[in-house]
Amino acid sequence: QRINTEKETLPKPIIWAKPSIMVTNGNSVNIWCQGAQSASEYQLYFEGSFFALERPKPSRSMNKVRFFISQMTSHTAGIYTCFYQSGELWSKSSNPLKLVVTGLYDTPNLWVYPRPEVTLGENVTFFCQLKTATSKFFLLKERGSNHIQNKYGNIQAEFPMGPVTRAHRGTYRCFGSYNDYAWSFPSEPVTLLITGGVENSSLAPTDPTSSLDYWEFDLSTNESGLQKDSAFWDHTTQN
């Protein structure tokens, strides 16, 4: 067991997940923990409880290890942290890694008002509806790191985007969540096209059908459970 003395601790390790922090129910995920070359043991904690350990072999690189979760479920979704030991000392805790399981229960509907193709500066609102009652909805933009918005709602949530800019164009999906780490199946994608302006271009993302596994999101905490890019998302109203 770890005994951490505040006076002497090693620097905190880095923790990340591959291929993504959003994992479809039943799929596998790798959690990497990178500490120091001198590390003799790495420990992974899940929701504050000891989850797994690895003692790297001297023949391999010892500065990082991979923890493999073979089947992601709602029981393995949540907050992970890791530590490493070198000599008699333990490191500080890594930053929390939040793993989300998707593909649970039901599929929401996503649509955009007034229509998917709008002119620059027009007001746009996304609507997400899920027949099974849920506590929170998430709107995500593909290939948009940090572009996550959440709203509370029972069966439906609306996401007003305000006057749109070129930064808003792209492909969106929404999810209903049963808790912050257990999400529904994704909605069908809705691609927002912006016309008008200087170049009069209506280009969509180069890969509008990209897999969920390759979305780039960073779910770090704030008071509502998710970090949003404040320049892009600043709607945190509650129903």
């Epitope: 000891f50 797994a52 350990l53 690895e54 493999f68 073979s70 393995t76």
Partner: nanobody, 119 residues
Amino acid sequence: EVQLVESGGSLRLSCAASGRTFASAAMGWFRQAPGKEREFVAAISRSDDTYYADSVKGRFTISRDNAKNTVYLQMSSLRAEDTAVYYCAAVVPTYGNNIYVHSAAYNYWGQGTLVTVKP
């Protein structure tokens, strides 16, 4: 299945796995005493690294035989508080030296064996 043993005695539990992926599995033993939560006992990685709960360290030994697709739990110096249903579990597949301590990590479970230690 029920196993009865005297206090201070020894017992070996075995768990045979079906399928061809045993060598790539990490294995573990858990136990659940009457009226209590399931708790971790011991685990072994695919490369034979082991880890034990403090309560059994020095008394229990986990091992595996990949040729027989079997994991063992050798229990000695048994005490009344070791009385429980013992479950073997597997994480299939796994990677490297991963040793899993949390029950949520395991995706296959045995049906359990009741071990009763008479005081």
